[in-house]
Amino acid sequence: QTSVSPSKVILPRGGSVLVTCSTSCDQPKLLGIETPLPKKELLLPGNNRKVYELSNVQEDSQPMCYSNCPDGQSTAKTFLTVYWTPERVELAPLPSWQPVGKNLTLRCQVEGGAPRANLTVVLLRGEKELKREPAVGEPAEVTTTVLVRRDHHGANFSCRTELDLRPQGLELFENTSAPYQLQTFVLPATPPQLVSPRVLEVDTQGTVVCSLDGLFPVSEAQVHLALGDQRLNPTVTYGNDSFSAKASVSVTAEDEGTQRLTCAVILGNQSQETLQTVTIYSFPAPNVILTKPEVSEGTEVTVKCEAHPRAKVTLNGVPAQPLGPRAQLLLKATPEDNGRSFSCSATLEVAGQLIHKNQTRELRVLYGPRLDERDCPGNWTWPENSQQTPMCQAWGNPLPELKCLKDGTFPLPIGESVTVTRDLEGTYLCRARSTQGEVTRKVTVNVLSPRYE
C-alpha cells in the first residue's frame, strides 16, 4: 500500500514543498514519485520511505507516489494548490467629470490570481461596497452602474480583489486598484443670459454681463467672454449655484461693424454658449456750416448741414429735400437774425435703432446803430423838482456807445434818476456810435414851472 504526505498542500506560486512517499512493504521493488516539477530526493535511511523536494511550483499539480511490492503495485496522489494575487486590478478609464443624473458604468478588470474559487472582486465607493462578485474568466470583469448624484462629487471609486485563504489556515490577501475620483457637475440646458448694448458708438465704453443659474459646482465653471476676436476679462461673482460675469468693453474705430459677442460657459466636459450681435458704429455729430459766422445786415447767408453718409438730416426742423445727409437754406441777414440758432438734427439707423445727433451754430448779424422814437423819444416834458429817469436806448450789433450832450458839453444822464431842474431844459444831440457807423437824434427836454396860487 502506497501513501503520500502531505496529501494536500497550498503554497505560493513559485514555491517549494517536501513530499514524502511511503510504502507498507519492507522491500519494495520500486518506490518513487511521478511529477513534471523539478524534484530533488533527500537521502533517508530505509527502503520504504522517500522524501522529495519539489520546487518552482507555478500551477496546481498532482504529483503521484508509486510503489511496487510483492503483493502488487499501488499509487497515491498529493494535491498541490498554488495561490497568487492578481497581477492587474484596474478600473476602466472614465472621464473625470460626469453629469449629475447620468448612469455611470464602472468596469473592473482583474488579470491573474488563484485559486479563483477563493478570489472575489469588490467595487467600492469610498469604503461602501457597491458590488461583490467571484472572479470569473480571464481577465475577470465585474461591472456595476451608478446613477451619478450631486453628493458623489469628489467621491473615490475603486476596485478591490480579495483572495481569502483563511479556511486554508492562511490570511486574506487584498489588492486595490488606483482610485477614480469622480467629479460631478450640473450644467443646465439653458444657455447663459447675455445682457449688452445692441449698438455701441466708436470711442465709447459699454458693459457686458453674462450670467447663468443652476450650476454645480459653480466655482469650477469657466467663463469665456469675447467681442469678435477680442478676449474680454470679466469680473466673475459667484452665488450658491450661479455666477455673473461682468466686463467693460471699449471700442475704437478698428471695431466698427457687426461683431459677435459670445459668452461660453464650460463645466466638466460640456459647454453652453450664447451669441449676440453688437453693431459698433461711428456717427460724428452733424456739421453746421455758415458762409460766415458774422455778417453785415443785408448779406446773403448760406447755412449748410452735413452728416454721416447714411444719416438723414433736418435743418431748423425742415427735412432735407430729398431726404438725406445734406440740407441747406439761404437767407438775407436782418437784425432779427442776430443770435439766431441754426440747428441741424441728424438721425442714423443702426441695427434697427435710431440714433440722434445735433449740432447748433449761431449767426451774428452786424447792424445799426439805430435810434428811434420808440426807444429814444424826441420830446420830454417834466415838472420841475420831480424825480425822472431819462431813457434813450440805442440799438445795434455791436451795441453802440450812446452820449446825449447839450451845447456839446452838458450831458443828459441817461438811465439815471435825477431831480428835474431848470438846467436840464434844452435840446440835446444824442449820438450812437459803433464799428458799423454812427447816428444822431435830437431830444428836447421841457421843464414845467410849478404854479403858485
Partner: antibody, heavy 119, light 110 residues
C-alpha cells in the same frame, strides 16, 4: 454667393502709380469692412489697408502710409486701392477681403491681382 | 512686438493628427484666425474666434489657445490638407490693424 474680383494689376515702373479695384457681390457691401492684403511671390501674407463699411474710418500699414489710399464706393459695390510712388518691394499679389468689422478676421478673399514694379 | 511666430514646416502621416502653433504677445488679448492657402490659390478662412469654423470647413479642423500661443489642430489629416497655413490676429501693439504669422507649410505623407 460671396464674390470678390480684383482688377487693375499690371507692370509699372518704380515711382509710378496704379489703381486697383475690387468688385463685390453676394453680400450687403456697405455693411462690411474691406481690406487689402498682399503676398510677394513665394512669401507670406501682409496686411496693407482696411476701411470701415461706411468708409468713414481707414487704416494703413506703416510700409505704405502716405503712398497708398484705400477708398470705397458703396453705390457701386467697389473697393479701391490707389497706389503711388511704387517701389520694387511692392511687387505682390494683392487680395481684397471682407470682414464683419474693420479690424476683424477675413471671411472671404478675392483671387488676387498681380502688381509688378520693375524698370 | 507685433510679430506672430510659426514653425516654417510641419509634416504628418495620412490619417494622423497634427498641431500647428502660433506665438505672439497679441494672442493674450485677441483670438487668432487661421487661413489655409493651397498652391496658386487665395487663402481660405478655416478657424476664427475661440474655436469656430465657417460653414464648409470639415470638423477635423479645430482651434485652441493658451497664454500667448494659438494652435490649429487637424485630426485625421487628409491629402487635400497639404497647404500653407497662416495665423492672423489683431495687433495689440497698435502699429498695424492685423498681423500675419510667417506661415507653416504642411506636408501630408503617404
Amino acid at each position: 454667393q460671396v464674390q470678390l474680383v480684383e482688377s487693375g494689376g499690371g507692370l509699372v515702373q518704380p515711382g509710378g502709380s496704379l489703381r486697383l479695384s475690387c468688385a463685390a457681390s453676394g453680400f450687403t457691401f456697405s455693411s462690411y469692412a474691406m481690406s487689402w492684403v498682399r503676398q510677394a511671390p513665394g512669401k507670406g501674407l501682409e496686411w496693407v489697408s482696411a476701411i470701415s463699411g461706411s468708409g468713414g474710418s481707414t487704416h494703413c500699414a506703416d510700409s505704405v502710409k502716405g503712398r497708398f489710399t484705400i477708398s470705397r464706393d458703396n453705390s457701386k459695390n467697389t473697393l479701391y486701392l490707389q497706389m503711388s510712388s511704387l517701389r520694387a518691394e511692392d511687387t505682390a499679389f494683392y487680395y481684397c477681403a471682407n470682414s464683419a468689422y474693420t479690424g476683424g478676421w477675413y471671411d472671404y478673399w478675392g483671387h488676387g491681382t498681380l502688381v509688378t514694379v520693375s524698370s | 512686438s507685433s510679430e506672430l511666430t510659426q514653425d516654417p514646416a510641419v509634416s504628418v502621416a495620412l490619417g494622423q493628427t497634427v498641431k500647428i502653433t502660433c506665438q505672439g504677445d497679441s494672442l493674450r488679448t485677441y483670438y487668432a484666425s487661421w487661413y489655409q492657402q493651397r498652391p496658386g490659390q487665395a487663402p481660405v478662412l478655416v478657424i476664427y474666434g475661440e474655436n469656430s469654423r465657417p460653414s464648409g470647413i470639415p470638423d477635423r479642423f479645430s482651434g485652441s489657445s493658451s497664454g500667448n500661443t494659438a494652435s490649429l489642430t487637424i485630426t485625421g489629416a487628409q491629402a487635400e490638407d497639404e497647404a500653407d497655413y497662416y495665423c492672423n490676429s489683431r495687433d495689440s501693439s497698435g502699429n498695424h490693424l492685423r498681423v500675419f504669422g510667417g506661415g507653416t507649410k504642411l506636408t501630408v505623407l503617404g
